[in-house]
C-alpha cells in the first residue's frame, strides 16, 4: 500500500487536486465499489464539536477574531472483513488567511509516511477552503487494525481530529500453535494453542490423527494435556469464531526410542598399538546421543574371546583405540546410547594393527672373551613373542671400546636366526660394552642394559663371562 504523506495546503486553485465537479464531503462512509461496513459515531448528530480546537491568535486587517478551527465529525468506528477495501476521511474548513498548512495521517500514535493511499482535496471559497483528507486501503489486513487520526499544523498550533477506529475482522489468527515434540512413551505432556479474532470469542477444538479430541470447545488459549502415547501421533487444533475456522499446522509427536546402530564404520588409520575409527551414527531415536561404546575383541579364533570396551562421547564420531597388540587382528563393533538406552552393536568389522618395533630388549645377554680366537662371544634370549610386536628380522649389536683416551662405537647387524654372535676384539687393554636390540620391519626395539667385559693386554688370561640377568633373576 502507499503511505500517507503530509501535503502543503495553499489557498486558491491547486493543480491536480481541485475537483470542481465534486461536492465537498465531510465524511465518506464508504467509497463506491467497497463493501459497506458497520459504522458507529462517537458523537451524537448535530452536537457541537468542542475537542481538538485551535483558536488562532491571528486577526484580519479589521482585527476581527477568527472562529476556532476543528476537524468536522466523521465516522468513529469501521468494522470490516479482512481483504475488503475501506475509505475514510477527515474534513476541515480553513480561512484563506492561512498559508502553508500541512495535514498528515497518524495511526496508533505513529505518523503514516510513505506510499499509503492518502488524497487531500481542496475546495476553495471566498473566505475559507474546505479540505478533505481521504485515506483508503484496498485490501485490509489485520495489521491495519487501529486508531487513525488527522493532524494539521497551523501557526505552530496542532489541530487533531477525533479518532477513526478500524476493526478488521476475519478468521481466527494463531498466535501460538502446537509444537512438534519428542516424548517418552506413556509420559504426559502438554500442547498449547492460542488464536485471536476479531471477532472474539475464539473457540478451540483439538484433533489427534484426524479425530477430534474434545467434544466441547475450549476458549482460546487452550492447553491439551495428553496422558501419554505409545506410538507417534499428529496433533492440530481448530480455531473457530463467527467468521469461520482456521486449522493449525499438524505437529508430529514422536516417541523416544533406543537409537539405531551406526550405518557406517571406517578404519581411518592403524599403527602397531592403535586403530583410529570413525562412524556415522544411525537414527537417534528422537533423543540426542549421549555417548558411544567401542567394543573390541581379538579376531584370532584361539583367543579367549574377552571383549575390551572403550566408552567415549557421542561427538565427534571418532575414536582412537589404544593399547592393542601389534600385528593382530581385531573385530570391532560400535554402539551408541541416548536417554532411552543403547543401540544394538553395529555389524562387527575387521581391523588389524601394523607391525611395530619390539617393545622390549633381548634377555639374558652374556658376553665372554674367546682369547684364542681374539673374539668376543655374545649370547642372548629373544624377547617374548607378545612383545616382539612383529616378525623378528634380526638384531642390532652396539659395542663400545674404551681405553685410555680412546672411545670407539661400532654397530653390527645380525640375522634373525640364532641367538649368538661373535665380534672381533678391536682394542686390547680396554673395556668392551655390549648392548643388543631386536629388529622387526616395524623398527628397532630398545637396547638391552649394557654388559661390560675387560679385554686384557696380550698374554693375560681372563675367561670369566659378563652378563645381564633375565627378568626375575636377581
Amino acid at each position: 500500500r502507499e503511505e500517507a504523506k503530509p501535503y502543503p495546503l495553499f489557498p486558491g486553485p491547486f493543480p491536480g487536486s481541485l475537483q470542481t465537479d465534486h461536492t465537498p464531503l465531510l465524511s465518506l462512509p464508504h467509497a463506491s465499489g467497497y463493501q459497506p461496513a458497520l459504522m458507529f459515531s462517537p458523537t451524537q448528530p448535530g452536537r457541537p464539536h468542542t475537542g481538538n480546537v485551535a483558536i488562532p491568535q491571528v486577526t484580519s486587517v479589521e482585527s476581527k477574531p477568527l472562529p476556532p478551527l476543528a476537524f468536522k465529525h466523521t465516522v468513529g468506528h469501521i468494522i470490516l472483513s479482512e481483504h475488503k477495501g475501506v475509505k475514510f476521511n477527515c474534513s476541515i474548513s480553513v480561512p484563506n488567511i492561512y498559508q502553508d498548512t500541512t495535514i498528515s495521517w497518524w495511526k496508533d500514535g505513529k505518523e503514516l509516511l510513505g506510499a499509503h493511499h492518502a488524497i487531500t482535496q481542496f475546495y476553495p471559497d471566498d473566505e475559507v477552503t474546505a479540505i478533505i483528507a481521504s485515506f483508503s486501503i484496498t485490501s485490509v489486513q489485520r495489521s491495519d487494525n487501529g486508531s487513525y487520526i488527522c493532524k494539521m499544523k497551523i501557526n505552530n498550533e496542532e489541530i487533531v481530529s477525533d479518532p477513526i477506529y478500524i476493526e478488521v475482522q476475519g478468521l481466527p489468527h494463531f498466535t501460538k500453535q502446537p509444537e512438534s515434540m519428542n516424548v517418552t512413551r506413556n509420559t504426559a505432556f502438554n500442547l498449547t494453542c492460542q488464536a485471536v479474532g476479531p471477532p472474539e470469542p475464539v473457540n478451540i477444538f483439538w484433533v489427534q490423527n484426524s479425530s477430534r479430541v474434545n467434544e466441547q470447545p475450549e476458549k482460546s488459549p487452550s492447553v491439551l494435556t495428553v496422558p501419554g502415547l505409545t506410538e507417534m501421533a499428529v496433533f492440530s487444533c481448530e480455531a473457530h469464531n463467527d467468521k469461520g475456522l482456521t486449522v493449525s499446522k499438524g505437529v508430529q509427536i514422536n516417541i523416544k526410542a533406543i537409537p539405531s546402530p551406526p550405518t557406517e564404520v571406517s578404519i581411518r588409520n592403524s599403527t602397531a598399538h592403535s586403530i583410529l575409527i570413525s562412524w556415522v551414527p544411525g537414527f537417534d531415536g528422537y533423543s540426542p546421543f549421549r555417548n558411544c561404546s567401542i567394543q573390541v575383541k581379538e579376531a584370532d579364533p584361539l583367543s579367549n574371546g574377552s571383549v575390551m570396551i572403550f566408552n567415549t562421547s557421542a561427538l565427534p564420531h571418532l575414536y582412537q583405540i589404544k593399547q592393542l597388540q601389534a600385528l593382530a587382528n581385531y573385530s570391532i563393533g560400535v554402539s551408541c546410547m541416548n536417554e532411552i538406552g543403547w543401540s544394538a552393536v553395529s555389524p562387527w568389522i575387521l581391523a588389524s594393527t601394523t607391525e611395530g618395533a619390539p617393545s622390549v630388549a633381548p634377555l639374558n645377554v652374556t658376553v665372554f672373551l674367546n682369547e684364542s680366537s681374539d673374539n668376543v662371544d655374545i649370547r642372548w634370549m629373544k624377547p617374548p613373542t607378545k612383545q616382539q610386536d612383529g616378525e623378528l628380522v634380526g638384531y642390532r649389536i652396539s659395542h663400545v671400546w674404551q681405553s685410555a683416551g680412546i672411545s670407539k662405537e661400532l654397530l653390527e647387524e645380525v640375522g634373525q636366526n640364532g641367538s649368538r654372535a661373535r665380534i672381533s676384539v678391536q682394542v686390547h687393554n680396554a673395556t668392551c660394552t655390549v648392548r643388543i636390540a631386536a629388529v622387526t620391519r616395524g623398527g628397532v626395539g630398545p637396547f638391552s642394559d649394557p654388559v661390560k667385559i675387560f679385554i686384557p693386554a696380550h698374554g693375560w688370561v681372563d675367561y670369566a663371562p659378563s652378563s645381564t640377568p633375565a627378568p626375575g633373576n636377581a
Epitope: P262, T263, E264, S266, V280, P347, L350
Partner: antibody, heavy 128, light 111 residues
Framework: EQQLVESGGGLIQPGGSLRLSCAVS????????MSWVRQAPGKGLEWIGI???????YSASWAKGRFTISKDSSKNTLYLQMNSLRAEDTAVYFC??????????????????????WGQGTLVTVSS | DAQLTQSPSTLSASVGDRVTITCQSS????????LSWYQQKPGKPPKLLIY???DLASGVPSRFSGSGSGTEFTLTISSLQPDDFATYYC???????????FGGGTKVEIK
C-alpha cells in the same frame, strides 16, 4: 515413510549418455551409504557401485570409467551418470540403501554389509 | 574377482515343502558371515530377507532361516507358502575388495 524413487531411464542410442536419479525420502543421504544395482532382462542382479555418506565412491571393476555415482545431499538425491552406453547395458537400474558399510580409508576400499531398502527401478534400453 | 555360486538354479516345490538353497563362495566372505539373502518377485525390486548369514530382516516370517560361515551358506524355507514362489539371491562382500557379489539366483517355482 522411507522410499526410493528412480527416474531418468528410457531409450538411448549406443554411445550415448544418460543420468539416472534416485529421489530419497524418509531418511538422509548424509547418514547413509547408497548403491546402484542393475538387472538385465531375464538375468540376475549385478552390483554397479556405492557412495558413502561422506561422498567416497567405489565401483565394480567393469563400471570404472564409464559409470559415475554422485549425490546432492541438499536435494536428498542420488545420481548415476552412464557414458558410452552399449546394448549390453540394457537393464532395470535400481538404487538401494546400504544398511551398513565399512570403509578402509587407508586402502581405498569398502565393503557392503546389506542392502536394506530398494527403489522400484527404472528401465534403460540401449538400442539403435 | 570372487564369485558366489547358487544351487540349484531352479527348484520346483509344493506349498508346505521344506526348501533349501545353497550358496558357495570362491573365497571367504568378509568376517565369515557378511552374507545376505534377497527375495525378488517378477517386476518388483529385491527385498532383504537375511543378513549376517542368519539374522532375519525386519518383517520377514520366521519360516525363513539362514546358516553357514566362511564359504558355504544355506537358505531354508521350513514350510513353503504361496507367497514364497520367487527368485532368491545370495550376496556378500570380501576383504580387500569393494565388489559386492550376487549369486546367480535360484528360482523357486510351483511343482
Amino acid at each position: 515413510e522411507q522410499q526410493l524413487v528412480e527416474s531418468g531411464g528410457g531409450l538411448i542410442q549406443p554411445g550415448g549418455s544418460l543420468r539416472l536419479s534416485c529421489a530419497v525420502s524418509g531418511f538422509s543421504l548424509s547418514s547413509n551409504a547408497m548403491s546402484w544395482v542393475r538387472q538385465a532382462p531375464g538375468k540376475g542382479l549385478e552390483w554397479i557401485g556405492i557412495i558413502s555418506s561422506s561422498g567416497s565412491t567405489y565401483s565394480a571393476s567393469w563400471a570404472k570409467g564409464r559409470f559415475t555415482i554422485s549425490k546432492d545431499s541438499s536435494k536428498n538425491t542420488l545420481y548415476l551418470q552412464m557414458n558410452s552406453l552399449r546394448a549390453e547395458d540394457t537393464a532395470v537400474y535400481f538404487c538401494a540403501r546400504v544398511g551398513f558399510f565399512v570403509g578402509y580409508g587407508a586402502y581405498d576400499y569398502g565393503i557392503i554389509h546389506r542392502l536394506d531398502l530398494w527403489g522400484q527401478g527404472t528401465l534403460v534400453t540401449v538400442s539403435s | 574377482d570372487a564369485q558366489l555360486t547358487q544351487s540349484p538354479s531352479t527348484l520346483s516345490a509344493s506349498v508346505g515343502d521344506r526348501v533349501t538353497i545353497t550358496c558357495q563362495s570362491s573365497k571367504s566372505i568378509y568376517n565369515n558371515n557378511w552374507l545376505s539373502w534377497y527375495q525378488q518377485k517378477p517386476g518388483k525390486p529385491p527385498k532383504l530377507l537375511i543378513y549376517d548369514a542368519s539374522d532375519l530382516a525386519s518383517g520377514v516370517p520366521s519360516r525363513f532361516s539362514g546358516s553357514g560361515s566362511g564359504t558355504e551358506f544355506t537358505l531354508t524355507i521350513s514350510s513353503l507358502q504361496p507367497d514364497d514362489f520367487a527368485t532368491y539371491y545370495c550376496a556378500g562382500g570380501y576383504s580387500g575388495d569393494s565388489d559386492y557379489a550376487f549369486g546367480g539366483g535360484t528360482k523357486v517355482e510351483i511343482k
